[in-house]
């Protein structure tokens, strides 16, 4: 079937970076400036994304791939293809509609984005707190009191951080 279609449809021979030009007897023509086609057999080329203003160009558009944008420092990308820029905060803060606010006691954020997350509850694992938590860092759980016999010195690292729940994706 594919072979039959190829014989019937000369456009299928047009590679990425070109389009099948109906105005020129379906000749494969290169994409015009500021446009691209990322797959073969296209009848049109897509307009390149323009990274304007606070959206900076991370990767230039080529004949076969769209431009990629990122955000000016102080903000970070959100959404598919960096469709939005969202404000950075300091570690120990989270972003609210009122701007960056410090994490409440008992919570932390070790990144410039995302939400404040509760400190690990060491006692749930029968452990004790070896290092207290801060706004920027989780607690470090140590051995349980029963483990504190001579020669026992294992330290449990904090639980892996969950993904920040601040992205629309």
């Amino acid at each position: 079937f594919e072979r039959t279609r190829s014989l019937q449809d000369p456009c299928s021979n047009c590679p990425a970076g070109t389009f099948c030009d109906n105005n020129r007897n379906q000749i494969c023509s290169p994409c015009p400036p500021n446009s691209f086609s990322s797959a073969g057999g296209q009848r049109t080329c897509d307009i390149c994304r323009q990274c304007k203003g606070v959206f900076r160009t991370r990767k230039e558009c080529s004949s076969t791939s769209n431009a990629e944008c990122d955000c000016t420092p102080g903000f970070h990308c959100l959404g598919a293809g960096c469709s939005m820029c969202e404000q950075d905060c300091k570690q120990g803060q989270e972003l609210t509609k009122k701007g960056c606010k410090d994490c409440c006691f008992g919570t932390f954020n070790d990144q410039k984005r995302g939400i404040c997350r509760p400190w690990t509850n060491c006692s749930l694992d029968g452990k004790s707190v070896l290092v207290n938590g801060t706004k920027e860092r989780d607690v470090v759980c140590g051995p349980s009191p029963a483990d504190l016999s001579p020669g026992a010195s294992s330290v449990t690292p904090p639980a892996p951080a969950r993904e920040p729940g601040h992205s629309p994706q």
Epitope: F75, M84, C85, K97, H166
Partner: nanobody, 123 residues
Framework: EVQLVESGGGLVQPGGSLRLSCAAS????????MNWVRQAPGKGLEWVAN????????YYVDSVKGRFTISRDNAKNSLYLQMNSLRAEDTAVYYC????????????????WGLGTTVTVSS
């Protein structure tokens, strides 16, 4: 085409005032949170203020509280920033930016930005 165009920037002396405007087109202005964001020379972006859809909620970065006032006129598809008691540190390019679809619930991303208007505070 979805577009934001800022105006009203200029040179002003310390202690002076300016009113920035942002004209919105190509979308239902009254359905979106709107923001002002600035970039001082050689610095990163800094969020300045935001306002909800009907103007009943307004928030400001600490450094401009009591000096700047954000407002909007949905009938005119316009956003404003009244800046009083201007200081040298307010010198920046000021951008108008639209809050994304889920702004305030799942994120605080801004998806449409103007190209900015320059405010210079100098004697």
């Amino acid at each position: 085409e979805v577009q934001l165009v800022e105006s009203g920037g200029g040179l002003v002396q310390p202690g002076g005032s300016l009113r920035l405007s942002c004209a919105a087109s190509g979308f239902t202005f009254s359905s979106y949170w709107m923001n002002w964001v600035r970039q001082a020379p050689g610095k990163g972006l800094e969020w300045v203020a935001n306002i909800n859809q009907d103007g009943s909620e307004k928030y400001y970065v600490d450094s401009v509280k009591g000096r700047f006032t954000i407002s909007r006129d949905n009938a005119k598809n316009s956003l404003y920033l009244q800046m009083n008691s201007l200081r040298a540190e307010d010198t920046a390019v000021y951008y108008c930016a639209r809050g994304g679809e889920e702004y305030g619930s799942s994120h605080y991303g801004m998806d449409v930005w103007g190209l900015g208007t320059t405010v210079t505070v100098s004697s």
